[in-house]
Interface confidence: medium
Amino acid sequence: RGAAPCQAVEIPMCRGIGYNLTRMPNLLGHTSQGEAAAELAEFAPLVQYGCHSHLRFFLCSLYAPMCTDQVSTPIPACRPMCEQARLRCAPIMEQFNFGWPDSLDCARLPTRNDPHALCMEA
């Protein structure tokens, strides 16, 4: 069947980050924005702490990935953005006995934006 249509970004944390359309299911398998928002809320303290300016954009690129009618798959952030966010934010998570989640494994993301593996660069 065809790709799901684009829908307006409704997750508060992901508003005003440079795009306003997303598509479900997202890159983590959530089927609705409500489901994605519930899990994303766990990262709110880290985003508020400000460990890295790209963290919010990177998280949103997974939980509410950019959607465009020209591309049938969700478009995540590129790997370097993930790695920079992890490098600066993981130490803070470790202070509170939280490891960087496997679901945010940077290795799953495209190294750079190219026609065969679209991703958003910083």
């Epitope: 790695e83 600066r88 993981a90 130490p91 490891g99 960087w100």
Partner: antibody, heavy 124, light 113 residues
Framework: QLQLQESGSGLVKPSQTLSLTCAVS??????????WSWIRQPPGKGLEWIGS???????YYNPSLKSRLTISVDTSKNQFSLKLSSVTAADTAVYYC????????????????WGQGTLVTVSS | DIVMTHTPLSLSVTPGEPASISCRSS????????????LDWYLQKPGQSPQLLIH???HRASGVPDRFSGSGSGTDFTLKISRVEAEDVGVYYC?????????FGQGTKVEIK
């Protein structure tokens, strides 16, 4: 005073697995604000970061070694370990373990404690 | 990977005289998020493990004499020793920690004349 002590095989045959352990004393490996790292130095050459691990088990690996590398931590024994598979003569080096400090308030980060190093020779 | 390049690779200094070591990175080490420049200097004395001298561009490590100072910006960095002493011999390494993998320069060997 924190001390790090490397131990393990000093001689490894080509294609085999190099195994080293770093015992930490004078402090807990589970303390926040640190990761625990391996760095190596081939004879007469410079330093190369191998990889790091947090007490939670989260790892960071040098991409050049990632396919052959496993770093693990045992908080109950206050130690962390390195395994490097399919070794060649190019893996001959002094291997250091070190603590990487991270200050979450300032962002300052650096290697503040090092072991004395252990020479690993890869030879048949 | 970020490439770190030292100049000179070796340096012979008279005790009491100043010395200067340069390090250049292949990209900026300034993190615009927090304003920190993630460049450290380590000294490896003969037969010993490396020891931290300067971290985050210009901050002297605990116990390091004030004759050591670090400076620079972006991609060009300098370690200065205002008056070299015999105990300062060894290989000096710069290291970047702004981006994985963390990388070291090839080192500058300092000896006493």
């Amino acid at each position: 005073q924190l001390q790090l002590q490397e131990s393990g095989s000093g001689l490894v045959k080509p294609s085999q697995t190099l195994s080293l352990t770093c015992a930490v004393s004078g402090g807990s490996i589970s303390s926040g604000g640190y990761s625990w790292s391996w760095i190596r130095q081939p004879p007469g050459k410079g330093l190369e970061w191998i990889g790091s691990i947090y007490h939670s088990g989260s790892t960071y690996y040098n991409p050049s070694l990632k396919s052959r590398l496993t770093i693990s931590v045992d908080t109950s024994k206050n130690q962390f370990s390195l395994k490097l598979s399919s070794v060649t003569a190019a893996d001959t080096a002094v291997y250091y373990c070190a603590r990487f400090y991270y200050d979450i308030l300032t962002g300052y980060s650096y290697f503040d404690y090092w072991g004395q190093g252990t020479l690993v020779t890869v030879s048949s | 990977d970020i490439v770190m390049t030292h100049t000179p690779l070796s340096l012979s200094v008279t005790p009491g005289e100043p010395a200067s070591i340069s390090c250049r990175s292949s990209r900026s080490l300034l993190d615009t998020d927090d304003g920190n420049t993630y460049l450290d200097w380590y000294l490896q004395k003969p037969g010993q493990s490396p020891q931290l001298l300067i971290h985050t561009l210009s901050h002297r490590a605990s116990g390091v004499p004030d004759r050591f100072s670090g400076s620079g910006s972006g991609t060009d960095f300098t370690l200065k020793i205002s008056r070299v002493e015999a105990e300062d011999v060894g290989v000096y390494y710069c290291m970047q920690s702004i981006q994985l993998p963390w990388t070291f320069g090839q080192g500058t060997k300092v000896e006493i004349k």
